[in-house]
């Protein structure tokens, strides 16, 4: 039975320009985490592998940053970059546990973030 | 103490394959991964691959996936690396290293196992 | 692959002074770069790990520093146990590779 919640940073917005650091945690299990993907609709932004390490998407490599921990952070934000973005996390036993995280990037600098939410 | 002890020096001619060991102490064997690392002629060393004691699971730097095998006996808390098709340019000290889960650095390393590749 | 190119590959020095090793990847690996000592006939041993933070048991002589593609690894006051070849490692993400090394020998 999966009993983890992820924890993400919500509905979040940012400046045109500037960065975000996308942050998923996943709690209330024991399971063993083995690989976090990071995607934007449908496409892969990075994958962090706990044998393997890192790695981001060609297409993304130069907006794209690894950490803070199993975290992302995205740079030189353009308003294209507004959407959801998923954390999907491997674990052992109990499977995969997915977390949304809308982003809007805002012309102006009235960016503010949301407050925390939790999917089961 | 965390400890990697490996297997004693071998001497094999050219052609045929080699199996060293590397028998953990002091810690969960399932709870670190195992990596093999190449040192030849005590310059430089080359990841040779990695394998995950608790899911069985192998990653191979490209240049070493037609050398090594990598394997795991729990019983006895021991990582394998066979070598086959042995050439002289495999002559080198080989290290069995542990990483940590999402740690992608070697805080323990074995002893170190001398092959000798010669007919 | 990361290519891991380090320098000097050999300095000479004397106990007392302070050395700088350096180490440049092909390309960013923001801060996951390890560094190892190791000594004649014996194994690597882990120093520093995401390019600052010392291992277990290392005196605080080390230091390292560095992001993206530009590293160090400063030792304050050496001692005569310094001696010996460094490497360093990105820990970014497969394949792992090490610098060539540098040998720091006793002047």
């Known amino acids: 039975m999966m009993t983890g919640t992820i924890e993400t940073t919500g509905n979040i917005s940012a400046e045109k320009g500037g960065s975000i650091i996308l942050q998923c945690h996943l709690s209330s299990t024991t399971a063993q985490v083995t690989q976090v993907n990071w995607e934007q609709q449908d496409q892969l932004l990075a994958i962090c592998n706990a044998d393997l390490g890192w790695h981001i998407s060609p297409s993304f490599k130069d907006r794209v940053a690894p950490g803070p921990g199993l975290g992302l952070t995205l740079q030189s934000l353009t308003v294209n970059d507004t959407g959801e973005y998923f954390c999907i996390y491997h674990t052992y036993p109990d499977g995969t546990y997915t977390g949304r995280i809308f982003l809007e990037v805002l012309e102006s600098s009235v960016a503010e973030h949301g407050a925390r939410f939790q999917i089961p | 103490e965390f400890q990697l002890q490996q297997s004693g020096p071998e001497l094999v001619k050219p052609g045929a394959s080699v199996k060293i060991s590397c028998r953990a102490s002091?810690?969960?064997?399932?709870?670190?991964?195992m990596n093999w690392v190449q040192q030849t002629n005590g310059k430089s060393l080359e990841w040779i691959g990695v394998?995950?004691?608790?899911?069985?699971?192998?990653n191979y730097n490209q240049k070493f996936k037609d050398k090594a095998t990598l394997t795991v006996d729990h019983s006895s808390s021991a990582a394998y690396m066979q070598l086959n098709s042995l050439t002289s340019e495999d002559s080198a000290v080989y290290f069995c290293?542990?990483?940590?889960?999402?740690?992608?650095?070697?805080?323990?390393w074995g002893t170190g196992t001398t092959v000798t590749v010669s007919s | 692959d990361i290519q891991m190119t380090q320098s000097p590959a050999s300095l000479s020095a004397s106990v007392g002074e302070t050395v700088t090793i350096t180490c440049r990847a092909s390309?960013?690996?923001?801060?996951?770069l390890a560094w190892y000592q190791q000594k004649q006939g014996k194994s690597p041993q882990l120093l520093a790990y995401?390019?600052?933070t010392l291992a277990e048991g290392v005196p605080s002589r080390f230091s390292g520093s560095g992001s993206g593609t530009q590293f160090s690894l400063k030792i304050n006051s050496l001692q005569s146990e310094d001696f010996g070849i460094y490497y360093c490692?990105?820990?970014?993400?497969?394949?792992?590779?090490f610098g060539g090394g540098t040998k720091l020998e006793i002047k």
């Open positions: 290293a542990r990483n940590g889960n999402f740690a992608w650095y070697f805080d323990v």
């Open positions: 490692q990105h820990h970014f993400g497969v394949p792992w590779t």
């Open positions: 390309e960013s690996i923001f801060s996951y």
């Open positions: 394998i995950n004691p608790k899911f069985g699971t192998i």
């Open positions: 002091g810690y969960s064997f399932t709870a670190y991964s």
């Open positions: 995401n390019a600052e």
